[in-house]
């Protein structure tokens, strides 16, 4: 907290500019009008203020807006955003995707922080659902975002938003999350033709049931082993040797290298040895 002192003669700030970097903390407190600061927030980031000076500027904004900053100020916070606490951010009402992007840009390249998490939560709750543009933005900054949501939260994602999801956005999802996302993806991509459909649905297949895998095996999809290894064990177990051979196509030879790992290991144990022998891979059931 900075003491209230009168502004020295001739030092009253007329605008937010470079001259303010030479002001001591108490001079900033006394000589910079909070309303002026709020209207010229976009200039703050161009000026190399010290962290201590930024603390003073934040304090002035807090006094001006005790109930939370308006979006016009939030959008131009820039590096001052890093000074905000989750408690500060919970007072905000951020509705513009541009504001969200501007603040995420400040934290770019860093791990998710409590401040960013609070900001995202406030934004998404305000929107009511995770629309495509929001999801696009969040996964661009944080590829692990989608897989950090609970199955319950994911259930409110509309199928139309699935178009924004890239394969790498699903890398850290668990089977429970994919169980929720897969039916949405199936719905979103239902009008695509066979090969295009497989390219899009492939990264969601960790949530696919047996009957869908059987259907895919009839479509010459040539699923790679990496995708096969991510399938649900309970969905793979009922597949016949012939169906797995059709599903994997030329990649079927890769089963040998994975014979000790799930789901391949469990699937092998369910098959008749005679059927496994037809693959010519030396798999032992």
């Amino acid at each position: 907290e900075v003491e209230k002192t009168a502004c020295p003669s001739g030092k009253k700030a007329r605008e937010i500019d470079e001259s303010l970097i030479f002001y001591k903390k108490w001079e900033l407190e006394a000589c910079v009008d909070a309303a002026l600061l709020a209207t010229q927030m976009d200039r703050v980031n161009a000026i190399p203020f010290t962290y201590e000076q930024l603390d003073v500027l934040k304090h002035k904004l807090d006094e001006l807006y005790p109930q939370g900053y308006p979006e016009s100020v939030i959008q131009h916070l820039g590096y001052l955003f890093l000074k905000m606490s989750p408690e500060d951010i919970r007072k905000w009402n951020v509705t513009s995707l541009e504001t969200l992007k501007a603040l995420l840009e400040v934290n770019k390249g860093h791990e998710m922080s409590p401040q960013v998490a609070t900001l995202i939560d406030r934004f998404v709750k305000g929107r009511g659902q995770l629309d495509k543009d929001t999801l696009d933005t969040l996964t661009a900054f944080y590829p692990g975002y989608l897989c950090s949501l609970s199955p319950e939260e994911l259930s409110s994602v509309p199928p139309s938003s699935i178009w924004a999801v890239r394969p790498q956005d699903l890398d850290t999802c668990d089977p429970r999350q994919l169980d929720v996302l897969y039916p949405k993806a199936r719905l979103a991509f239902q009008n695509m033709n066979g090969s295009e459909y497989f390219v899009k649905i492939q990264s969601f297949l960790g949530g696919a049931p047996t009957e869908d895998l059987k259907a895919l095996s009839q479509q010459n999809v040539s699923m790679d082993l990496a995708t096969f290894m991510k399938l649900r064990t309970d969905a793979v177990l009922p597949l016949t040797v012939a169906e797995v051979q059709k599903l994997l196509g030329p990649h079927v030879e890769g089963l040998k290298a994975e014979e000790r790992h799930r789901p391949v290991r469990d699937w092998i144990l369910r098959q008749r040895q005679d059927d496994l022998d037809t693959l010519g891979l030396g798999l032992q059931g």
């Epitope: 998710m112 998490a117 890398d171």
Partner: nanobody
């Protein structure tokens, strides 16, 4: 680098209760969970708790164990009731900074805390 420190393990009679705690250094946006390993057995997922507080439990502990987390303090707890001899194991806290897949790299593990239930 995230570090996880568990506490609260110990010995208890069958039918008794214990509360395990886990404190994380560093911010956890992804899942947190409890795993256990009994002598001679494979590691078993006990509970996974998502950031919104939704928890999923292994069938063997459903209704007896309750997991909760505090996102602001980066802590996780496991309330264990009606303990039996089969619950004897080393219990490990796990966390991901983002995401929830325990089977791929990026999982942080605690050192573990021993729980022993005698009948």
């Amino acid at each position: 680098q995230v570090q996880l420190v568990e506490s609260g393990g110990g010995s208890v009679q069958a039918g008794g209760s214990l509360r395990l705690s886990c404190a994380a250094s560093g911010y956890i946006y992804g899942c947190m969970g409890w795993f256990r390993r009994a002598p001679g057995k494979a590691r078993e997922e006990v509970a996974t708790i998502y950031r919104d507080g939704t928890a999923y439990y292994a069938n063997s502990v459903e209704g007896r164990f309750t997991a909760s987390r505090n996102n602001a303090e980066n802590t996780l707890s496991l309330e264990m009731n009606s303990l039996n001899a089969e619950d004897t194991a080393m219990y490990y806290c796990a966390a991901r900074t983002t995401g929830c897949n325990w089977d791929i790299s990026g999982v942080y593990w605690g050192q573990g805390t021993q729980v022993t239930v005698s009948s």
